[in-house]
Interface confidence: low
Amino acid sequence: TPVVRKGRCSCISTNQGTIHLQSLKDLKQFAPSPSCEKIEIIATLKNGVQTCLNPDSADVKELIKKWEKQVSQKKKQKNGKKHQKKKVLKVRKSQRSRQKKTT
């Protein structure tokens, strides 16, 4: 059943409906383990609802690909912003050092 159990699988049923990438807040995949012998995919929607997805479904496999692509793009964007910030800091530092020299 649809409930988290300590030391057990989380999902008894899987969601039948289509879940769109836009409505996803998070997507977690759990590999088989001693406490649960099957792959579990748990989606957290933007409205806070958590639901179990069918790992064998073609739609779900496609959703996972899109989600992973989106996550990696966001990481790249974050890294890009960090890189830009570092450049700005370097520029500011060099400007300060020039100012010090001129005074």
């Epitope: 409930v3 300590k6 989380s10 008894i12 969601n15 012998e37 639901t51």
Partner: antibody, heavy 124, light 109 residues
């Protein structure tokens, strides 16, 4: 339409075995957890067993643990209940029921589809 | 193991009256895990309420559920002739274990 049809009930002697079947139609059987629930004559409902959508998890009531086995064949859209070492107190109408749609992992959606039941009588 | 107690055992009312059915748990139950069913003679049970207060598909709004912790209530605001039946509460617990209450019979006065 969504339907569950039980079969396999009958009169059986104490200590003998019986296998119940539940044929599902009108929905994607492999996406749903399934239950067996029974009702002794003139009594209330008693939950018997549950099986996850893929058969990985099974749960049993203490009264049947070690004697009954729940299983499913998703290729045949069929749920089973193997009943061994039957006792007089196992006499009941046995219903199969579908786990409620939704499968939110922090929520129990009840049993939303039920069969009409099959009668098991254990008597010498 | 959680034990559910339902009261009263029998409720005798007339059509149009309000019915209040109680379900008490021996220990605290998450409201997310409580359901109510209706059963008429010779028929399979029918899901009415899940998550303590959410109506199942096709259930009229005269049926409502409430409660939390150990005390839950099913209310039928105005009894219709077809509402005279036995009502069961049910809880889901880990392991997984599902427990039904003993039922409340609502009959015609």
């Amino acid at each position: 339409q969504v339907q569950l049809v039980e079969s396999g009930g009958g009169v059986v002697q104490p200590g003998r075995s019986l296998r119940l079947s539940c044929a599902a139609s009108g929905f994607t059987f492999s996406d749903y957890g399934m239950h067996w629930v029974r009702q002794a004559p003139g009594k209330g409902l008693e939950w018997v067993a549950v099986i996850s959508h893929n058969g990985a998890i099974k749960g049993y009531a203490d009264s049947v643990k070690g004697r009954f086995t729940i299983s499913r064949d998703n290729s045949k859209n069929t749920l089973y209940l193997q009943m061994n070492s039957l006792r007089a107190e196992d006499t009941a109408v046995y219903y199969c029921a579908r786990e409620g749609d939704g499968s939110n992992i922090y929520y129990y959606y009840g049993m939303d589809v039920w069969g009409q039941g099959t009668t098991v009588t254990v008597s010498s | 193991e959680i034990v559910l107690t339902q009261s009263p055992g029998t409720l005798s009312l007339s059509p149009g009256e309000r019915a209040t059915l109680s379900c008490r748990a021996s220990q605290s139950v998450s409201s997310s895990y409580l359901a109510w069913y209706q059963q008429k003679p010779g028929q399979a049970p029918r899901l009415l309420i899940y998550g303590a207060s959410s109506r199942a598909t096709g259930i009229p709004d005269r049926f409502s559920g409430s409660g939390s912790g150990t005390d839950f209530t099913l209310t039928i605001s105005r009894l219709e002739p077809e509402d005279f039946a036995v009502y069961y509460c049910q809880q889901y617990g880990s392991s997984p274990i599902f427990t039904f209450g003993p039922g409340t019979k609502v009959d015609i006065k």
